[in-house]
Amino acid sequence: DWVVAPISVPENGKGPFPQRLNQLKSNKDRDTKIFYSITGPGADSPPEGVFAVEKETGWLLLNKPLDREEIAKYELFGHAVSENGASVEDPMNISIIVTDQNDHKPKFTQDTFRGSVLEGVMPGTSVMQVTATDEDDAVNTYNGVVAYSIHSQEPKEPHDLMFTIHKSTGTISVISSGLDREKVPEYRLTVQATDMDGEGSTTTAEAVVQILDANDNAPEFDPQKYEAHVPENAVGHEVQRLTVTDLDAPNSPAWRATYLIMGGDDGDHFTITTHPESNQGILTTRKGLDFEAKNQHTLYVEVTNEAPFVLKLPTSTATIVVHVEDVNEAPVFVPPSKVVEVQEGIPTGEPVCVYTAEDPDKENQKISYRILRDPAGWLAMDPDSGQVTAVGTLDREDEQFVRNNIYEVMVLAMDNGSPPTTGTGTLLLTLIDVNDHGPVPEPRQITICNQSPVRQVLNITDKDLSPHTSPFQAQLTDDSDIYWTAEVNEEGDTVVLSLKKFLKQDTYDVHLSLSDHGNKEQLTVIRATVCDCHGHVETCPGPWKGG
């Protein structure tokens, strides 16, 4: 029959070539001479000429060694034609199967594989996987079937069989207990991949297993007892650096220390932080310590890690004896800010108040006083008694120095300690108003027509406070009332000035006396420009020169 069973050809054949494979034969050759040919990849299309057929004999030839890893199967067509070129058979499938030879060693996908596992894990824990490939056939033969094994382990501690590898998957697992990062931080395994399912060619690679840190070591104080000296009152002062050792991986949460003051700090005077590089506990004062109240503190500090312990571990404790050192403390004014009411304009030499300071120190130190800041120079202070007296006129209405009736003075107290220290106090003088200012009209110049004049409304101001202000009273003096009238409005805070007789165009002085509710009188001269005009005017019309 015009059929060829699949032809198996081993790869890497040694020849000699051409090599006979099979004979194509049509039974039509009884009737006529048959010519044979083949087509397909490997025959008349790339890779061309690998296979050929003798036209008259039908012998199929192989012209070169085959490589299964390049082409594993060739699918050709055989043709049979008569002498006149007519096809005598349908094209026949010719399958050439390239059978595998074990001509490739396994190859690891990496020279070095890296994996990691936590120290102290149980046997059976998976670590990593190594992979090797083999180009040979692993389906129909064992040529490409890779078996993995561990050839060696370095270091061989605690013994040489800490790991195992799955023969077929390459998964490396822990086989023994005793992984301890602090003793062996890294293992180097020489792994083997062997084809023929472990019976053939071998290749090696390195598997580096990093042992990851677990918090299986507690930090320990070294030393456990400390003595420190701290000046009183110092806030944020470094008292002591506490040193710990921890065998776990530096700069990891299992190594980084967490400090806690367990006792001895009832007043919450201290705080402890961890230094980010050295891991030391930095004990500092949260508040100032008071030598006079307590001159020694005994603190108990416990250390743990940022990460929890993976097993029950004893906690290390340190004892710190803090000796508080006496310092010369500054006098403190009582109160720190003193408010005193005083009448403005009191006579020079009149006492204002006594403002004194207390010294926190136990010794009876002498305190002397002086004024530190007195912007207007109105006050003096007795250095011994702290008596404050007026040496200038206190003026409530002085806008340069007085704000909201308050005059602010800073005073200084100095003790006679060694070295001397100073404290300051603030004296706030609330100045009580006296009727020392009369009412004043605004504006003090007016322009008015001499015919149908418009009434001029003047505002009245008084620097004093109520009740030394409105209602005001107005009165014209020095014959000004002949030509003018002045009336205070109902509210009593404006005065209306009216021209009651004709005056020729000129400038006139109007003498206006205003008095406040406390009868403080103030005489003001109003300059009135009279113009030849009717009604309202801003400036006199025409070329006119005031006399």
Epitope: G15, P16, P18, R20, A52, E54, T57, W59, L61, N63
Partner: antibody, heavy 118, light 107 residues
Framework: VQLVEESGGGLVKPGGSLKLSCAAS????????MSWVRQTPDKRLEWVAT????????YYPDSVKGRFTISRDNAKNTLYLQMSSLKSEDTAMYYC???????????WGQGTTVTVSS | ELVMTQSPSSLSASLGEGVSLTCRAS??????LIWLRQEPDGTIKRLIY???SLDSGVPKRFSGSRSGSDYSLTISSLESEDFVHYYC?????????FGAGTKLEIK
């Protein structure tokens, strides 16, 4: 009838070159592998070169590899052997022979003599 | 390379007599062996291929056989044209190698 006829033999000095030809007739030349075989003066036969039917692949023994080149022109039904760096031991009768039934050497020519001598 | 040891190198026999020529292969070549004959004028012809298959036009007095690594050409009844040179060639291993030849002479 399959016929092959060699030509191109002659006398050549050592280190010289020579090209032999083999004209084929009476069969489909392009579908058969072809070879050169030589017979030394002591009557020993030695395979020299083979070329696949399509001319894609060539084969040589170590004794001539790198010095001899076999080629073919299927359009002209002609086989060639280019010989260079000739040695006295290359002196022989050179035959061209065809594969037949997928094996050597089904049909032989009459041969052409090559003499390498100074 | 594979060596073909042909024996005898020469053989005298009478017309009508039967003779056998032998080639021994130094390695396994399977059935990949042919026998050739060379006429006095240098003409070479293949007689047998694949150890025992007769080429077309070859008389039936010629036959080939194998016993292990020994390959034989047998001429059952010698005729006058048979007194020529005979060679074996193996094509089971590369390179192709010939036997040294046997010269068959008339007694």
């Amino acid at each position: 009838v399959q016929l092959v006829e060699e030509s191109g033999g002659g006398l050549v000095k050592p280190g010289g070159s020579l090209k032999l030809s083999c004209a084929a007739s009476g069969f489909t030349f392009s579908s058969y592998a072809m070879s050169w075989v030589r017979q030394t003066p002591d009557k020993r036969l030695e395979w020299v070169a083979t070329i696949s039917s399509g001319g894609h692949y060539t084969y040589y023994p170590d004794s001539v590899k790198g010095r001899f080149t076999i080629s073919r022109d299927n359009a002209k039904n002609t086989l060639y052997l280019q010989m260079s760096s000739l040695k006295s031991e290359d002196t022989a009768m050179y035959y061209c022979a065809s594969y037949y039934y997928g094996i050597p050497f089904g049909y032989w020519g009459q041969g052409t003599t090559v003499t390498v001598s100074s | 390379e594979l060596v073909m040891t042909q024996s005898p190198s020469s053989l005298s026999a009478s017309l009508g007599e039967g003779v056998s020529l032998t080639c021994r292969a130094s390695q396994d070549i399977g059935i990949n062996l042919i026998w050739l004959r060379q006429e006095p004028d240098g003409t070479i012809k293949r007689l047998i291929y694949d150890t025992s298959s007769l080429d077309s036009g070859v008389p039936k007095r010629f036959s080939g056989s194998r016993s292990g690594s020994d390959y034989s050409l047998t001429i059952s009844s010698l005729e006058s044209e048979d007194f020529v040179h005979y060679y074996c060639l193996q094509y089971g291993s590369s390179p192709l190698t010939f036997g040294a030849g046997t010269k068959l002479e008339i007694k």
